[in-house]
Interface confidence: low
């Protein structure tokens, strides 16, 4: 599982190294909702209907990598199902195919932005606006991360289980 997913799981309070079977083949998209109480303060002040607040024009453009991730997430959704707590779970199985790529990407970016802010707890720059991305409006990949993360091996082989790094290894993860 990717760092982004691992982080989201930690934010959900799922601290075990065993991922839900549902998600074992789902990579590339965060499929767990961040708890409201874990949402950083600047996100609480953000209109949830405006997922692009604090994003730059550049970030709003549809990148190939974003499209790839959306495609992967769609495939994952359709083949593996979605965790019940996923922000994408309510009716998405029936409606996702009707959504535009732009909408899916916007929602994906908003989720990543929430994750990033949650992990580092940084607030928006006061002067930030929709044209000026705050230092934290950017998408931090897998901000939850330092969780008890065994993410190293999870990243290196997304389907493999984290063997748990040895304490003495430089790559010791958090």
């Amino acid at each position: 599982m990717k760092r982004k997913e691992r982080i989201a799981r930690r934010l959900e309070g799922i601290e075990t190294d065993t991922q839900p079977i549902l998600l074992q083949s789902c990579t590339g998209l965060v499929t767990h909702r961040l708890l409201e109480e874990d949402t950083p303060r600047y996100m609480r002040a953000t209109d949830p209907a405006s997922p692009h607040i604090g994003r730059s024009n550049e970030e709003e453009e549809t990148s190939d990598s974003s499209l790839e991730k959306q495609t992967r997430s769609k495939q994952c959704t359709e083949t593996s199902g979605i965790h019940a707590d996923s922000p994408y779970s309510s009716g998405i199985m029936d409606t996702q195919s009707l959504e535009s790529k732009a909408e899916r990407i916007a929602r994906y970016k908003a989720e990543r932005r929430r994750q990033l802010a949650e992990k580092y707890g940084l607030t928006l720059d006061p002067e930030a606006d929709s044209e000026t991305p705050s230092r934290y409006s950017r998408s931090r990949k897998d901000p939850e991360a330092a969780e008890k993360r065994g993410v190293r091996s999870e990243r290196s082989a997304e389907s493999s289980r984290d063997a748990g790094s040895s304490y003495s290894r430089t790559e010791l993860s958090g």
């Epitope: 760092r3 897998d142 958090g174």
Partner: antibody, heavy 114, light 112 residues
Framework: EVQLQQSGAELVRPGASVKLSCTAS????????MHWVKQRPEQGLEWIGW????????EYASKFQDKATITADTSSNTAYLQFSSLTSEDTAVYYC???????WGQGTTLTVSS | DIVMTQAAPSIPVTPGQSVSISCRSS???????????LYWFLQRPGQSPQLLIY???NLASGVPDRFSGSGSATAFTLRISRVEAEDVGVYYC?????????FGAGTKLELK
């Protein structure tokens, strides 16, 4: 297994520029941030800045804002740290590390001397 | 900028004993979301730093449970029970609440 392989030691003249590299294996750097950290001889750690390789976004500590440039090449899965106008104060070991500071490169020793 | 202070430059300890390493921040690292944004690292001699603790009290993967982190909003403690020879090195705290992320000066753990 995640690994960060950094480029070899550098000996450069004052005023010159240098570009250090950090090549990741075992994961795609687009799925993470990459930090650079400085450690002067017998001293502590200083955070230089980071990059989101997917979109090129960067953030720097103010003291390195005009000194360092962090870039990334996703095709080669490599992050870079470039210094300009080097001085003896830049002599240090430089580490790259993943976004959660949980995987570190072995460090690159940069020596600035005439 | 947030200043991280580790008052003890070094701590001598006998193997098998417990030790506590302290760190203070010039500003609260407790976020309104309940998380305290503090890392602990160990840098063994001649090695790269290693992450031990994240968010003040969470044990990093692969780290022995002899290590534990605790603290308040501005005062933090890394405790090592039953110190072993491999624990020798410099311990750093680091805040990642605000830019620039900042480290403490480090506390060197030495065996008696």
């Amino acid at each position: 297994e995640v690994q960060l392989q950094q480029s070899g030691a550098e000996l450069v003249r004052p005023g010159a520029s240098v570009k250090l590299s950090c090549t990741a294996s075992g994961f795609n750097i687009k799925d993470d941030h990459m930090h650079w950290v400085k450690q002067r001889p017998e001293q502590g750690l200083e955070w230089i800045g980071w990059i989101d390789p997917e979109n090129g976004d960067t953030e720097y500590a103010s003291k390195f804002q005009d000194k360092a440039t962090i870039t990334a090449d996703t095709s080669s899965n490599t992050a870079y740290l470039q210094f300009s106008s080097l001085t003896s104060e830049d002599t240090a070991v430089y580490y790259c590390t993943t976004g959660e500071f949980d995987n570190w490169g072995q460090g690159t020793t940069l020596t600035v001397s005439s | 900028d947030i200043v991280m202070t580790q008052a003890a430059p070094s701590i001598p300890v006998t193997p098998g004993q417990s030790v506590s390493i302290s760190c203070r921040s010039s500003k609260s690292l407790l976020h309104s979301n309940g998380n305290t944004y503090l890392y602990w690292f160990l840098q063994r001699p001649g090695q790269s730093p290693q992450l031990l603790i994240y968010r003040m009290s969470n044990l990093a993967s692969g780290v022995p449970d002899r290590f534990s982190g605790s603290g308040s909003a501005t005062a933090f403690t890394l405790r090592i029970s039953r110190v072993e020879a491999e624990d020798v090195g410099v311990y750093y705290c680091m805040q990642h609440l605000e830019y620039p992320f900042s480290f403490g000066a480090g506390t060197k753990l030495e065996l008696k």
